[in-house]
């Protein structure tokens, strides 16, 4: 079925995606494990006019060695201001001095590069030693070249189209990726989808793509899904400043829980299919749709918030842009960390500066507990027993108080830590949708209803079901019920939460083969997520429940066995 969603470019004020990649239009890497001299050649194409470039060389002390000498041949087509970092590297730099200007003295040996065509530049370089790597980059903003990392498929460098330079070279294009958006016809509501599609590269080695998502809207205003699709060898590390539904291929984890990998799904690998997926997830707007080469870091900045979608060209601004501090946004940037019976608030200065805010003070409710200035951030820390902390059975609460120059009254924000020792998570199985009578028995062909509870209840946190599966032992295998907070298959339904906010779902089980297992284990991973504030307070728990299985009739639909 064709999904009606006319993708159109989105203005940069609505969404912008920048990325770092090791994919180049043309390049090669040689296997050069113990090279005395590493020769690297970079062909850099810039649009007309002077460009700025940050070039970093990093030595890898693999096996305690690195090349005794490095020759970097830099061929550019127009004027470049170069910021070079090559600390402690025995570097010889060959470049055209009429085109390349250093922002500061390079502090390395330099050689004038003759104005040759590409083939002759390669010959010139090869005369000095076997070429370790060569790459052609179009309008780079920054380049990282790792020495001693060359691990190509051949022991000599041979240019290939759409080459993945692996760990040898990573770069960031100056031009952000094309972001498109559209309205999904016939879907009500304000849920927005952000779709990122990473295209396969030449190399099929395991890769982690870090996806940074910054949505600038009040946390409560957002109902969003992040769809990440890539080749099977890609896993995702998500760093988001908002809670959102996650839907990915491969595996994903969150920056705050990098070691906890969550299994993704098989997603379509076409734009149409991905739009269909967004529609299936009840999104009414595709706020951003981006296709990228195989990237290592992707940053998405969007300001859509499930409101109207604006595609380019954007209307002319009639009011001057807001250049003053936004207190609401500032308060949303305060990160709360809870550990070792202490609450820590962190506010990064870089973000504060970005918002054009000037902070004159950050304290807890008790003004004598002041934040410490740690250079790049303000850090406010207190034990649960002081600074006016309010301790309840489930939570420790306080207030962050921020004084800003542009406001006469201080800004206040409730901050919380969960008292994990006192919280207990329970799985309940019920035989009717009224969730009145608990049971520990399921009957194939009959619907079963599941509810997850946390006690005591925690009103400031949202309890969500991340995944659930039913382990039926060696004969029955595993039945996936919920993955990535979504129902798996048409015999599993996510239900409306209880009045207290407890997640609920139903499922139907059927066996096509015998013997039918007599017992099973229902296992669910749940998350407590703050309704406002940062994801670093998110808590995940896995809850188990032993179930008995009684003999079935022959109706039903979730097949397994």
């Amino acid at each position: 079925e064709t999904v009606h969603c006319d993708l159109q470019p989105v203005g940069p004020e609505r969404g912008e995606v920048t990325y770092t990649t090791s994919q180049v239009s043309k390049g090669c890497v040689a296997q050069a494990p113990n090279a005395i001299l590493e020769v690297h050649v970079l062909f850099l194409e810039f649009p007309t006019g002077p460009s700025q470039l940050e070039l970093t060389l990093q030595a890898s002390k693999q096996n305690g060695t690195w090349p005794r000498e490095v020759l970097l041949v830099l061929s550019v087509n127009s004027s470049v201001f170069l910021h070079l970092q090559a600390l402690g590297i025995p570097l010889h730099l060959a470049y055209n001095s009429s085109l390349v200007t250093f922002q500061e003295p390079p502090g390395v040996n330099t050689t004038e590069l003759p104005s040759f065509p590409k083939t002759q530049i390669l010959e010139w370089a090869a005369e000095r030693g076997p070429i370790t790597s060569a790459a052609e980059l179009n309008d780079p903003q920054s380049i990282l070249l790792r020495l001693g990392q060359a691990q190509g498929s051949l022991s000599f460098c041979m240019l290939e189209a759409s080459q993945d330079m692996g760990r040898t070279l990573e770069w960031r294009p100056r031009t952000p990726a094309l972001v498109r958006g559209c309205h999904l016809e016939g879907v009500a509501g304000h849920k927005e989808a952000h779709i990122l599609r990473v295209l396969p590269g030449h190399s099929a080695g395991p890769r982690t793509v870090t996806v940074k998502v910054e949505l600038s809207c009040a946390p409560g205003d957002l109902d969003a899904v992040l769809i990440l699709q890539g080749p099977p060898y890609v896993s995702w590390l998500i760093d988001a400043n908002h809670n959102m539904q996650i839907w990915t291929t491969g595996e994903y984890s969150f920056k705050i829980f990098p070691e906890k990998n969550i299994r993704g799904f098989k997603l379509p690998d076409t734009p149409q299919g991905l739009l269909g997926e967004a529609r299936m997830l009840n999104a009414s707007i595709v706020a951003s749709f981006v296709e990228l080469p195989l990237a290592s870091i992707v940053s998405l900045h969007a300001s859509s918030c499930g409101g109207r979608l604006q595609t380019s060209p954007a209307p002319i601004q009639t009011t001057p842009p807001k250049d003053t501090c936004s207190p609401e946004l500032l308060m949303s940037l305060i990160q709360t960390k809870c550990a070792d019976d202490a609450m820590t608030l962190v506010l990064k200065k870089e973000l504060v500066a970005h918002l054009k805010c000037t902070i004159t003070g950050l304290t807890f409710w008790d003004p004598s507990c002041e934040a410490e200035d740690r250079g790049d951030k303000f850090v406010l820390r207190s034990a649960y027993s002081s600074c006016g902390m309010q301790v309840s059975a489930s939570m420790i609460s306080n207030e962050a108080v921020v004084n800003i120059l542009s406001s006469s009254s201080p800004q206040r924000k409730k901050v919380h830590c969960l008292n994990m020792d006192s919280l207990s998570f329970q799985l309940g199985l019920y035989l009717s949708p009224h969730f009145l009578q608990a049971s520990n028995t399921i009957e194939p062909g009959q619907q079963s209803f599941v509810q997850v509870r946390v006690s005591p209840s925690v009103s400031e946190f949202l309890l969500q079901l991340d995944s659930c599966h039913l382990d039926l032992g060696p004969e029955g295998g595993t039945v996936e019920l919920i993955q990535g907070r979504a129902a798996k298959g048409n015999c599993v339904s996510l239900l409306s939460p209880s009045p207290e906010g407890d997640p609920r779902f139903s499922f139907l089980l059927h066996f096509y083969t015998v013997p039918i297992p007599k017992t099973g284990t229902l296992s669910c991973t749940v998350a407590l997520r703050p309704k406002t504030g940062s994801q670093d307070q998110e808590v995940h728990r896995t809850v188990f429940m032993r179930l008995n299985i009684i003999s079935p009739d022959l109706s039903g639909c979730t097949s397994k066995g």
Partner: antibody, heavy 119, light 111 residues
Framework: EVQLLESGGGLVQPGGSLRLSCAAS????????MSWVRQAPGKGLEWVST????????YYADSVKGRFTISRDNSKNTLYLQMNSLRAEDTAVYYC????????????WGQGTLVTVSS | NFMLTQPHSVSESPGKTVTFSCTRS????????VQWYQQRPGSSPTTVIY?????PSGVPDRFSGSIDSSSSSASLTISGLKTEDEADYYC??????????FGGGTKLTVL
């Protein structure tokens, strides 16, 4: 000026051996991967073997694997192809070719040497 | 493994334009670069096009290369045909598994 000069071709009986040489001049020999490409009479080009600049890595076409050995002596600027267990289908003009620096193509070729395998 | 297929022969009159095709039997032609070599009778091959469409110095701009991903084929076009263009033309492709693969060659006769 880049020059490649092959030698060592001739008539050999099936099952016999032959060693081809290619003398290179006009470039830094050790910086370049080198190859042998052959052409049977009236037929097309067929890649045979490649060796990296340092001589540590070698690559062979399936048709010659286990029978032919490519090697080089960088101090003498010379490339070799040792051909054992020769067959009638190995009859061809053998060209020594330089792989372009970081390029996927052969940028310089020798004039070729004819190897005839016949009883 | 794949093969590169070229038409056996092509004939054209001087001054005209001729196009040679090279079709990859499986996989995408765009996944890597295509090269073209000219071999005049009794001579060694020389590169006329490399990396799809690049001309080595000394090769006239009458020679041009292109690829068509949809048909997985590459083309070599010679315009303003001259009698000295009479030769065999070979396409070549590098693949990580098969390494250097040549097409069977096309014989160009200038009438």
């Amino acid at each position: 000026e880049v020059q490649l000069l092959e030698s060592g071709g001739g008539l050999v009986q099936p099952g016999g051996s032959l060693r081809l040489s290619c003398a290179a001049s006009g470039f830094t020999f050790s910086s370049y991967a080198m190859s042998w490409v052959r052409q049977a009479p009236g037929k097309g080009l067929e890649w045979v073997s490649t060796i990296s600049g340092g001589g540590h890595s070698t690559y062979y076409a399936d048709s010659v694997k286990g029978r032919f050995t490519i090697s080089r002596d960088n101090s003498k600027n010379t490339l070799y192809l040792q051909m054992n267990s020769l067959r009638a289908e190995d009859t061809a003009v053998y060209y020594c070719a330089r792989i372009a620096p970081a390029g996927p193509h052969f940028d310089y070729w020798g004039q070729g040497t004819l190897v005839t395998v016949s009883s | 493994n794949f093969m590169l297929t070229q038409p056996h022969s092509v004939s054209e009159s001087p001054g005209k334009t001729v196009t040679f095709s090279c079709t990859r039997s499986s996989g995408s032609i765009a996944s890597n670069f295509v090269q073209w070599y000219q071999q005049r009778p009794g001579s060694s091959p020389t590169t006329v096009i490399y990396e799809h469409n690049q001309r080595p110095s000394g090769v006239p701009d009458r020679f041009s290369g292109s690829i068509d991903s949809s048909s997985s084929s590459a083309s070599l076009t010679i315009s303003g045909l001259k009698t000295e263009d009479e030769a065999d033309y070979y396409c070549q492709f590098y693949d990580r598994n098969s390494h250097w693969v040549f097409g069977g060659g096309t014989k160009l006769t200038v009438l």
